[in-house]
């Protein structure tokens, strides 16, 4: 509340975050031109990365795009991408949407159809959708620990959200248990109203917000935080605006003396910690 | 504008960036003692690094010190670093600017320098100038998507800067374009009043700032963003300061069962987004 | 000091942080049932990562498991995780502190005990306390160099912590030198009250305050930075709110056809820098 | 169903080597464990060697130095190589594995052991 009387201070935060769980992953794997069923386990070194403090990701879901290698090769036939002769292809020409700079020729993608050959990491990156339901649906269960230390240096005040008291084995409950900075992922998207299982196939951004309201009046002392949750990316956003959140990276390795990579489209949580508030003192 | 009956209030905000684009790089590779053209293509995997919201890097120059092992060398010879017997070397000393620990013997570098032995990745890496002009110097005509949410908590008021109405292949421009939230990166630095091509080399630091002046009373509400551009690193700085911008990275592998890698001190734009601004209502 | 004429606005930063510092790490080292002594050099792209720049992170100490592989093994014989018969084994459970899926079998873990059989990262990861004294404990050493470039935007003020007069071989010292903007890591502990050796071992969170009291008044300007240090993880933090700073990553490489991976419990010091303070005018 | 078929077994003379392998047969999800068992005459059978998934091996102090366990996981097979024979090496040598025959449903198979006999 706002006490005119008194001098307000932002607050200095720090933030520390903690992801626990494991997920079962069964998909269908296809080696040698045989298809069989691959199944999984993911800790956090497989689906979490380390990232600064007032932010976590976790991956939701993926698309791999195995064994690729520079070269020459036919692009993607995305929409408006065949062609039919050369007169198509335009040679150094780099197409935005594409992944590689045209050769100048038109050759065979499969049997039915012809593209853009292109200088790229061949075979280029098939654009297709992300797995429904998400590979890694079962993170709704993962819990992520927040540490946050705050300061208010003109008040010379400093405290932290865990204090010597709070139980080790809690999960914040937005009744039950609303200090308990233990949180399952599942149940902050619920808390914002959202579905999980939904989201993961995408992926998205969820903010959780620290507001800290201080009166650091000796007479009336109170400083404690208070959690809530709200879905950042626009769910409703078009296609041309790259709905959710994902991003690719790689994994680079060396066979037959020929440099490969594993290109691995992530999709996933980001999370968010926004602190805020401020403290009073007369 | 200072409207002093209004309550003022900070901009709570989170961004998410998409950067779009491939950069074809020509470089001299040696094999074998063999020097030859080497022509490959870089896409986001390969350029990029999943960092934090607020902040994105784009490399755009690299040297490479491949097939780096443990073991003994004689350190690179840089300016005082020579010797021409042993007295001159001090086993155990670290020197900040060298890479590895002397044995305390003089040996030769090459047929005409001797410079002391160091326990370290060797070969050490050679002290050359970042190559001129960068390797990936098309990525001036990379974009950038920048999706930016904000929250005035206590006006319990959210909003973002890309509306449902906004076209996906736009591109900002100061005059005909101001709310395109997607950036061509030679124009942000054009923006800026400085040379692409030329930070390219030594890597630097973009500021993009987005600036909320809201005003959130019902019958003059406006809340939209306005962005500018600042270069934020200093292109006057000393060398002994470290000018420009790149870190060193490592790619480990195991060879003849022999823990190598290389290492890349990539040179680049680190784009830091700067949100600011307030929330105001009677 | 607060001045009630002015037009206070708070600072707008950014931040980019060098890391120096070679570490000479000596471990026991097992290959094929032989145990050895080890001896590692460590230089800045194996102990640090790149961050954003308002958060620099510094590898203190480690544990690996390696050669890991997704197949069954007994769990890690924590306290309570034994077993002597399959009854009190569950198909399927996923216990939180395991690191694998329960598959209903209770099997040997080495001569004496028994243990869940799990599909998993096998061998999981022994539960062992990091090393003491932490292996690169000589990272007390390292140096880093911290640029920090403000802006008030409503003041259209820009400055840097780093002057043309600045010597780059200075150190940062409370007294001597207190605009030097190199600091040596134990010089921040030693500061804020903190026994670095200790710290290492388990990892911790520092923070490194840059204080901005500007008055921007031509006739009585001033405008320099301050900088102050604290511990901002909780050392008295019980056990099951993990103390100390670590996270866990993977290098992944492919042997013998079956995808493994080198497991890195990473034990570090995490700086966080806090930029605060307020530019004000007439 | 799931198989394990020895082969390589026979006769040969002290100081002499033989290779087995054990190949594993039938539709299952995952081998995992593998390993070299052997039954002297009147003896129990005792391990020789194992290995995992992951090529981390272990082998029996009598045979140690001497022998080596190998696997290809591309043709799910597990091999002996036994050099430096001795007459105490004589026995019948029975494969074992670990496989999974679906997600999570591990299964310990045996193979019907290969004669291994070692003489002058």
């Known amino acids: 509340s706002d006490k005119l009387y008194q001098r307000k201070e932002p607050v200095i935060s720090s933030v520390h975050t903690k992801v626990k769980g494991i997920a079962e992953v069964t998909e269908n794997v296809t080696e040698g031109g045989v298809t069989k069923l691959g199944h999984s386990i993911f800790d956090t070194a497989d689906y979490t990365f380390p990232l600064q403090g007032n932010s976590f990701f976790v991956m939701t879901n993926y698309v791999k795009s195995e064994g690729q290698v520079q070269t020459l090769c036919p692009e993607y036939p995305r929409r408006g991408a065949q062609c039919s002769s050369d007169r198509r292809c335009k040679k150094g020409w780099m197409d935005p949407q594409s992944k590689g700079i045209q050769t100048g020729r038109c050759v065979p993608y499969d049997k039915t159809r012809k593209t853009c050959e292109v200088s790229a990491w061949c075979p280029t990156e098939e654009e297709k959708e992300a797995p429904r339901p998400a590979l890694l649906r079962s993170a709704e269960n993962f819990t992520v620990l927040i540490k946050n230390n705050i300061h208010f240096p003109g008040h010379n005040y400093t405290t932290r959200n865990i204090l010597p008291t709070m139980n080790g084995s809690c999960t914040f409950h937005k009744t039950w248990d609303p200090q308990c900075s233990i949180f399952r992922l599942g149940d902050i998207f619920q808390e914002a109203g959202e579905n999980f299982t939904e989201v993961a196939v995408q992926g998205g951004i969820m903010g959780i917000e620290i507001y800290w309201d201080c009166n650091l009046d000796s007479w009336s002392h109170h400083c404690r935080p208070r959690y809530s949750f709200r879905r950042l990316d626009d769910k409703n956003m078009d296609e041309s605006f790259v709905p959710g959140y994902n991003f690719r990276y790689a994994k680079y390795y060396k066979e037959n003396n020929v440099e490969k990579r594993t290109l691995i489209k992530a999709f996933g949580i980001r999370f968010d910690i926004l602190v805020f508030g401020t403290g009073g003192k007369f | 504008s200072d409207k002093l009956y209004q309550r003022k209030e900070p901009v709570i905000s989170s961004v998410h960036t998409k950067v779009k684009g491939i950069a074809e790089v020509t470089e001299n590779v040696t094999e074998g003692g063999v020097t030859k053209l080497g022509h490959s293509i870089f896409d986001t995997a390969d350029y990029t690094f999943p960092l934090q919201g607020n902040s994105f890097f784009v490399m755009t120059n690299y040297v490479k010190s491949e097939g780096q092992v443990q073991t003994l060398c004689p350190e690179y010879p840089r300016r005082g670093a020579q010797c021409s017997s042993d007295r001159r070397c001090k086993k155990g000393w670290m020197d900040p600017q060298s890479k590895g620990i002397q044995t305390g013997r003089c040996v030769p570098y090459d047929k005409t320098r001797k410079t002391c032995e160091v326990s370290a990745w060797c070969p050490t890496e050679e002290e050359k100038e970042a190559p001129r002009p960068a390797l990936l110097r098309s990525a001036e005509n990379f974009t950038v998507l920048i999706k930016n949410n904000i929250h005035f908590p206590g006006h319990n008021y959210t909003t973002r800067n890309i509306l449902p109405t906004m076209n996906g292949s736009c591109t900002f421009h100061k005059t005909w374009d101001p709310q395109c939230s997607i950036f061509r990166l030679g124009d942000i630095f054009q923006e800026a009043g400085e040379n692409f091509t030329e930070v390219a080399v030594q890597g630097g630091i973009m500021g993009i700032e987005i600036y909320w002046d809201c005003n959130l009373d019902s019958w003059s509400h406006h809340c939209r963003p306005r962005y500018s551009f600042r270069r934020l690193d200093d292109k006057n700085m000393d060398e002994s300061f470290v000018p420009g911008y790149n870190f060193r990275y490592a790619k480990y592998y195991k060879e003849n069962n022999v823990e190598k890698r290389t290492l890349i001190k990539a040179f680049g734009i680190r784009f830091d987004i700067l949100v600011f601004g307030t929330g105001g209502k009677f | 000091s607060d001045k009630l004429y002015q037009r206070k606005e708070p600072v707008i930063s950014s931040v980019h942080t060098k890391v120096k510092g070679i570490a000479e790490v000596t471990e026991n080292v097992t290959e094929g049932g032989v145990t050895k002594l080890g001896h590692s050099i460590f230089d800045t792209a194996d102990y640090t990562f790149p961050l954003q720049g308002n958060s620099f992170f510094v590898m203190t100490n480690y544990v690996k498991s390696e050669g890991q592989v997704q197949t069954l093994c007994p769990e890690y014989p924590r306290r309570g995780a034994q077993c002597s018969s399959d009854r009190r084994c569950k198909k399927g459970w996923m216990d939180p502190q395991s690191k694998g899926i329960q598959t209903g079998r209770c099997v040997p873990y080495d001569k004496t005990r028994k243990t869940c059989e799990v599909s998993a990262w096998c061998p999981t990861e022994e539960e062992k306390e990091a090393p003491r004294p932490a292996l690169l404990r000589s990272a007390e050493n390292f140096t880093v160099l911290i640029k920090n470039n403000i802006h008030f935007p409503g003041h259209n003020y820009t400055t840097r912590n780093i002057l043309p007069t600045m010597n780059g071989s200075c150190t940062f010292h409370k007294t001597w030198d207190p605009q030097c903007s190199i600091f040596r890591l134990g010089d921040i502990f030693q500061e804020a009250g903190e026994n670095f050796t200790e710290v290492a071992v388990q990892g911790g969170i520092m923070g490194i305050e840059i204080y901005w009291d500007c008055n921007l008044d031509s006739w009585s300007h001033h405008c320099r930075p301050r900088y102050s240090f604290r511990r901002l993880d909780d050392k008295n933090m019980d056990e099951s709110f993990v103390p100390g700073y670590n996270f866990r990553y993977a290098k992944y490489y492919k042997e013998n056809n079956v995808e493994k991976r080198t497991l890195i419990k990473a034990f570090g010091i995490r700086f966080d820098i806090l930029v605060f303070g307020t530019g004000g005018k007439f | 169903e799931v198989q394990l078929v020895e082969s390589g077994g026979g006769l040969v003379q002290p100081g002499g080597s033989l290779r087995l392998s054990c190949a594993a047969s039938?539709?299952?999800?995952?081998?995992?464990?593998m390993a070299w068992y052997r039954q002297a005459p009147g003896k129990q059978r005792e391990l020789v060697a194992d290995?995992?998934?992951?090529?981390?091996?272990n082998y029996a102090d009598s045979v140690n130095g001497r022998f080596t366990i190998s696997r290809d996981n591309v043709r799910n097979t597990v091999y002996l190589q036994m050099n430096g024979l001795k007459p105490e090496d004589t026995a019948v040598y029975y494969c074992?594995?670990?496989?999974?025959?679906?997600?999570?449903?591990?299964?310990?198979?045996w193979g019907q052991g290969t004669q291994v006999t070692v003489s002058s």
């Open positions: 039938g539709s299952f999800f995952r081998v995992n464990n």
């Open positions: 074992y594995a670990t496989i999974e025959l679906g997600v999570l449903e591990p299964r310990d198979y």
């Open positions: 290995i995992t998934r992951g090529d981390r091996t």
